[in-house]
């Protein structure tokens, strides 16, 4: 599967949509900045095999999809942009799932790197908790939008793993 190219293209499209989704000036939200601790160091210090990279990227995109599929999210963003963004994420999930089947065969389950998957889940839990604490305010969503854009850009090491042959 030609995942690096398709993923890169879809990722760029998703980032463009995410950038367009802003509703209020981020300049007014500086005091709402928060440390979400994206597990950057863990990712940077690891050479991902292709199936590992796929499973971690899948988790990141799945969690992002879940986050932006809530009722609170629907109230926060312009509907047509949100739908396009969700569709883009959904397509990425499909691409990754199709690739997993091709890489390891239908019967086999990819070796899930539990530590990395758990780190991603905890990261998104912190984001969800922050939104709850901030009562899903427009500024809280702006901060989260900026954070998700950053985490998408940070997953470079995972993308390198997509180019590897296991």
């Amino acid at each position: 599967c030609d995942l690096p190219q398709t993923h890169s293209l879809r990722n760029r499209r998703a980032l463009i949509l995410l950038a367009q989704m802003g509703r209020i000036s981020p300049f007014s939200c500086l005091k709402d900045r928060h440390e979400f601790r994206f597990p950057e160091e863990e990712f940077d210090g690891h050479q991902f095999q292709k199936t590992q990279a796929i499973s971690v990227l899948h988790e990141m995109i799945q969690q992002t999809f879940n986050l932006f599929s809530t009722e609170d999210s629907s109230a926060a963003w312009e509907q047509s942009l949100l739908e396009k963004f969700s569709t883009e994420l959904y397509q990425q999930l499909n691409d990754l799932e199709a690739c997993v089947i091709q890489e390891v065969g239908v019967e086999e389950t990819p070796l899930m790197n539990e530590d990395f998957i758990l780190a991603v889940r905890k990261y998104f839990q912190r984001i969800t908790l922050y939104l709850m604490e901030k009562k899903y305010s427009p500024c809280a969503w702006e901060v989260v939008r900026a954070e998700i854009m950053r985490s998408f850009s940070f997953s470079t090491n995972l993308k390198k793993g997509l180019r590897r042959k296991d």
Partner: antibody, heavy 121, light 107 residues
């Protein structure tokens, strides 16, 4: 390597216009805001304003609002600071610096080398 | 606008001394406070961000503390290269504002 490279020193006459630049490299230009800071001779740092290059949204310090214009061209990773009519009191060193926006990362971690603007008749 | 007041405005110290500079904000800025060092003819250099986080590459003799309205920059053992002007800056709300600076001179 992250770098902010500013345009060279300028000597102008009162009433003239001027546009100085700050070119970013070694990072995603649209992922960071660019702020401008003035330092008059022998004085402290004064924050002038900021731009988000991704959409050219700007914010100014009240002291500089209407006095200067901040802009950016993301296609060439460059931010600008401009004056339509310079005054002798605009004589200063001007610095640009990058800011991580709403992300939890160091503020103004990289600075340009500064552009010295001298306004004299 | 939030006013930032630094004290002292200048101080004389010797190599090896422990130096403390304080910065007070006119209203609460949480932990959104940065410290910069500037040497003559050079651009400012970030030392501390978010009140107490040491910027990468900055020696550990520099430390920051505080939250709300009162903040401190400490140099545990002053080195010859530390003689410079230090500025605090709030990034809690726009417009960002700097303190007036503290010049650290050789005694």
């Amino acid at each position: 390597e992250v770098q902010l490279v500013q345009s060279g020193a300028e000597v102008k006459k009162p009433g003239e216009s001027l546009k100085i630049s700050c070119k970013g490299s070694g990072y995603s230009f649209t992922s960071y805001w660019i702020g401008w800071v003035r330092q008059m001779p022998g004085k402290g740092l004064e924050w002038m304003g900021i731009i988000d290059p991704s959409d050219s949204d700007t914010a100014y310090s009240p002291s500089f609002q209407g006095q200067v214009t901040i802009s950016a061209d993301k296609s060439i990773s460059t931010a600008y600071l401009q004056w339509s009519s310079l005054k002798a009191s605009d004589t200063a060193m001007y610095y640009c610096a990058r800011h991580p926006g709403l992300n939890w990362a160091p503020d103004f971690d990289y600075w340009g080398q500064g552009t010295l603007v001298t306004v004299s008749s | 606008d939030i006013q930032m007041t630094q004290s002292p405005s200048s101080l004389s110290a010797s190599v090896g001394d422990r130096v403390t500079i304080t910065c007070r904000a006119s209203q609460s800025i949480s932990k959104f406070l940065n410290w910069y060092q500037q040497k003559p003819g050079k651009a400012p250099k970030l030392l501390i961000y978010f009140a107490s986080s040491l910027q990468s590459g900055v020696p550990s003799r520099f430390s920051g503390s505080g939250s709300g309205t009162d903040f401190t920059l400490t140099i545990s053992s002053l080195q010859p290269e530390d003689f410079a002007t230090y500025y605090c800056q709030q990034s809690n709300t726009l417009p960002f504002t700097f303190g007036q600076g503290t010049k650290v001179e050789i005694k």
